[in-house]
Amino acid sequence: CKAMHVAQPAVVLASSRGIASFVCEYASPGKATEVRVTVLRQADSQVTEVCAATYMMGNELTFLDDSICTGTSSGNQVNLTIQGLRAMDTGLYICKVELMYPPPYYLGIGNGTQIYVIDPEPCPDSDF
């Protein structure tokens, strides 16, 4: 299969509500009409799939119903949002893009975005 460059930010800080967003951009060598995007988490040399979606160019990304990810596409950019993150989910999140159709098939894997998640401090009890 053919290789393709994928770019993503090096570091992202999740919001206090456990939401992190980043852009995954791929250098499409041709006019792909069908794309598959997968987010993988690498931590302690273990790689696990976070979510995956396919989309037709110009349409919304379709994630599984129980996915913690949402996203939109614009040209060769995919805007990804991961929700429900906790401090223990801190890690390297890697964007993988596959151009499924038309042939030839292209595969690109980003260097990863280090997402830092800080659990919010509980509110102190009020005396009132």
Partner: nanobody, 119 residues
Framework: EVQLVESGGGVVQPGGSLRLSCAAS????????MGWFRQAPGKEREFVAD????????YYADSVKGRFTISRDKSKNTVYLQMNSLRPEDTALYYC????????????WGQGTLVTVSS
Amino acid sequence: EVQLVESGGGVVQPGGSLRLSCAASGGTFSFYGMGWFRQAPGKEREFVADIRTSAGRTYYADSVKGRFTISRDKSKNTVYLQMNSLRPEDTALYYCAAEPSGISGWDYWGQGTLVTVSS
């Protein structure tokens, strides 16, 4: 060294069926994904189908959706491609491929098995 060996190719009439097999040997297998690609003479290599082994989730190219089915047998380290309602345009060399991890890419490839659909 991991080896992928395909079998099951052959000559079949339009509308017929074939079942391709891909057996992995020579290593310890916990592949992230296994898939099938094909290449017709003078054309680019094309994605056909894959299965992500942890969730058993399958994905198909539009051109084969509803006609082809990918499955796996973990105990035999084997992945299958059941091909029904074959068409002349399905004629190609079919390759099995394996992804050791989600970020490795398709590191392992078989030698291919030829499928010819002709009357």
